[in-house]
Amino acid sequence: MAVTACQGLGFVVSLIGIAGIIAATCMDQWSTQDLYNNPVTAVFNYQGLWRSCVRESSGFTECRGYFTLLGLPAMLQAVRALMIVGIVLGAIGLLVSIFALKCIRIGSMEDSAKANMTLTSGIMFIVSGLCAIAGVSVFANMLVTNFWMSTANMYTGMGGMVQTVQTRYTFGAALFVGWVAGGLTLIGGVMMCIACRGLAPEETNYKAVSYHASGHSVAYKPGGFKASTGFGSNTKNKKIYDGGARTEDEVQSYPSKHDYV
């Protein structure tokens, strides 16, 4: 019962996590214009992995895709790659874990097979979550570096009269969504791995040791000891699970749609 619950919960948590990773990857607000000095702005800039956007105070929003591939920073390409790998691994993990769920019967699938599939999906979720966390963290580090660089030359004087204000960017909503989603996927993966241990049929050899007293007399000599031992046949202690006895309701979770402004 506890194993089924752990497995089911792990699946649901991972599902929410992967939905979050997909959402974060698609979101435009990975970096947003820093409004520390000017909380009310007429032009608000924000950027995602795939396009950059400008929201005017008039309400109009204009987004432009990054149509170049070679012209993009290597770090951005790396973040894209990490997020996509995370999504792909997570999606495969979800597919595998659906068939591994104890509450779903597929033909005469052995518990050992389900255990292996659960472990596989768990590892995939862990790697997926780590990819997402790594991707978001790399981007965040890039932002911090750029933030302090642009702060150092916030104003570039032109003839001592004209000022060019450099736009500084700070953490966008997508980073927090990505971190939380990656964490959830990671937790879900760990739960699946824990559930796998409970699913696996344990084959433990308990060697029964029997001591037989010898029929003939034993002469005890100083400094010496002799005893004969007889070993009985090994007995296998096998745990048996009643897989089909109980069925539990399948839990489905749908990611809610948020509008990040």
């Epitope: 702005t41 007429a42 032009v43 800039n45 924000y46 400008v54 005017e56 109009f60 204009e62 736009t167």
Partner: antibody, heavy 118, light 113 residues
Framework: QIQLVQSGAEVKKPGASVKISCKAS????????MNWVRQAPGKGLEWIGN????????TYNHKFKGRVTLTVDTSTSTAYMELSSLRSEDTAVYYC???????????WGQGTLVTVSS | DIVMTQSPSSLAVSLGERATINCKSS????????????LTWYQQKPGQPPKLLLY???TRESGVPDRFSGSGSGTDFTLTISSLQAEDLAVYYC?????????FGQGTKLEIK
Amino acid sequence: QIQLVQSGAEVKKPGASVKISCKASGYSFTDYHMNWVRQAPGKGLEWIGNIDPYYGSPTYNHKFKGRVTLTVDTSTSTAYMELSSLRSEDTAVYYCANYGRGNSFPYWGQGTLVTVSS
Amino acid sequence: DIVMTQSPSSLAVSLGERATINCKSSQSLLNSGNQRNYLTWYQQKPGQPPKLLLYWASTRESGVPDRFSGSGSGTDFTLTISSLQAEDLAVYYCQNDYSFPFTFGQGTKLEIK
């Protein structure tokens, strides 16, 4: 088509308040901010502030902060601008103007002349 | 606040000739996010509200004749009327649309020589 119709001319005494209305038609009123601009006789244009009709949140030019209040009535698609503690230098034509692309003002009201005189 | 300075304050040009009005801002109006300059040009005739001519420094508003064109980037901008018509006689204003408070130039009065 989009139209912005403003209330009639006003004559006020110094220290008094004036409230000008701007009725919008031809578009969804809550979709676009309403800006207010004034022009003193023979002088240039001066931006007073704007208001988001959807949230009712205003943004003011700090020069007028504390004296100007921008409000909206979404049921009648009307924007209001109230200027208090009037001085003679507040004598001007007051315009309401709709927002467009590039934060520009493509649609303007006909203007309301406010005369402050003792 | 961003200060907008227009030059000249008045300009006399013959009909059919080219008219050029300059506008300088105390701060760059170029937005790095979309590489657009947030500068708008208006035309105002006596007794009328201003009329939008160009936004984003060079994008013509619909219905505006193509003899009106805008150029410039950052802090220096120009409004050009390629062939002056009688109906173009008015006061022209440039406006900062990049940061609050929005500010206007003092205006350039265009007259017939």
